[in-house]
């Protein structure tokens, strides 16, 4: 099994309410195969924000084309940010399995939301 790192380059991102937030994440390898997921928070109560392989996430779009076979950029863009979106977001790599097995998490990116400029 190859050594894999999940890199979230920004420790924090600040966005005005109503704008879009870009949360960057890259992986250093495609192996082992398995999906990437984004969560807000940690532990059993963490909130799923985006799942690479299934689900409907209308406010979330991948920054790069996820259908590219060599894609290692798992950055996402969240639209129409509100204060309720504040928190720390983690990009997490899973290894395939039944169920998939969490392999490695990025260090997290804290999203803060500024008041909408008047």
């Amino acid at each position: 099994e190859e050594e894999l790192q999940v890199i979230q380059p920004e420790k924090s991102v600040s966005v005005a309410a109503g704008e879009s937030a870009t949360l960057n994440c890259t992986a250093t390898s495609l192996i082992p195969v398995g999906p990437i997921q984004w969560f807000r928070g940690v532990g059993p109560g963490r909130e799923l924000i985006y799942h690479q392989k299934e689900g409907h996430f209308p406010r979330v779009t991948p920054v790069s084309d996820p259908t590219k076979r060599n894609n290692m950029d798992f950055s996402i863009r969240i639209s129409n940010i509100t204060p309720a979106d504040a928190g720390t977001y983690y990009c997490v790599k899973f290894r395939k399995g039944s169920p998939d097995v969490e392999l490695k998490s990025g260090a997290g990116t804290e999203l803060s939301v500024r008041a909408k400029p008047s």
């Epitope: 192996i31 392989k53 060599n70 039944s98």
Partner: antibody
Framework: DVQLVESGGGVVRPGESLRLSCAAS????????MSWVRQAPGKGLEWLAG????????YYIDSVKGRFTISRDNPKNSLYLQMSSLTAEDTAVYYC???????????WGLGTLVTVSS | ALTQPASVSANPGETVKITCSGG??????YAWYQQKSPGSAPVTVI????KRPSDIPSRFSGSASGSAATLIITGVRVEDEAVYYC???????????FGAGTTLTVL
């Protein structure tokens, strides 16, 4: 319902060219990677080429690199396979297939028969 | 290359297992494709090792471990007679491959 309909097959002479088309409906074509797979008479399935959802990235099996070109026109919901320098070994039923998130196939067309004969 | 048995036979109601070997567990996802007659459109019965499309009967299931994948048909029916192709996607090479196919005969 997802529907994939291939066309453009027929009888050609060795050395000639042919362009196959695949008309897609029932899903958001521009969101999915696509592939071409063929089956020679009495033989098994053989993957030929794949293309990312946006069309920027293409992938080929070694035996058709330089002779076959996969492309797509997302506004027309169409996938293409341009084949040149055809030989008798290219005689087969050619299928287009929609890719899953991890580049397997979930839906297949009915196929179009290509016969290369002098 | 993916390797699978050339043929398997079973009586109606029995459980059938078809194995597929040759892929690296860490880099390969498997799928199973059913083809009822040569030249007819394949049908995906399992993808992503164990995911069954919504229109496929629940008697079809899949698993993967080590370097092998298995298609399981629990309570096989006469209408399940077909050639079953194992397919793989290798994340190292970006290439799709298929096994040679297994002919399932229901006696």
């Amino acid at each position: 319902d997802v529907q994939l309909v291939e066309s453009g097959g027929g009888v050609v002479r060795p050395g000639e060219s042919l362009r196959l088309s695949c008309a897609a409906s029932g899903f958001t074509f521009s969101s999915y990677a696509m592939s071409w797979v063929r089956q020679a008479p009495g033989k098994g399935l053989e993957w030929l080429a794949g293309i990312s959802a946006g069309g920027s990235d293409t992938y080929y099996i070694d035996s058709v690199k330089g002779r076959f070109t996969i492309s797509r026109d997302n506004p027309k919901n169409s996938l293409y396979l341009q084949m040149s320098s055809l030989t008798a070994e290219d005689t087969a039923v050619y299928y287009c297939a929609r890719e899953t998130w991890n580049h397997l196939f979930d839906y297949w067309g009915l196929g179009t028969l290509v016969t290369v004969s002098s | 290359a993916l390797t699978q048995p050339a043929s398997v036979s079973a009586n109606p109601g029995e459980t059938v297992k078809i194995t597929c070997s040759g892929g690296d567990y860490y880099s390969t996802y498997y799928a199973w494709y059913q083809q009822k007659s040569p030249g007819s459109a394949p049908v995906t019965v399992i993808h992503s090792d164990d995911k069954r499309p919504s229109d496929i009967p629940s008697r079809f299931s899949g698993s993967a471990s080590g370097s092998a994948a298995t298609l399981i048909i629990t309570g096989v029916r006469v209408e399940d007679e077909a050639v079953y192709y194992c397919g793989g996607y290798d994340g190292r090479t970006y290439i799709n491959t298929f096994g040679a196919g297994t002919t399932l005969t229901v006696l």
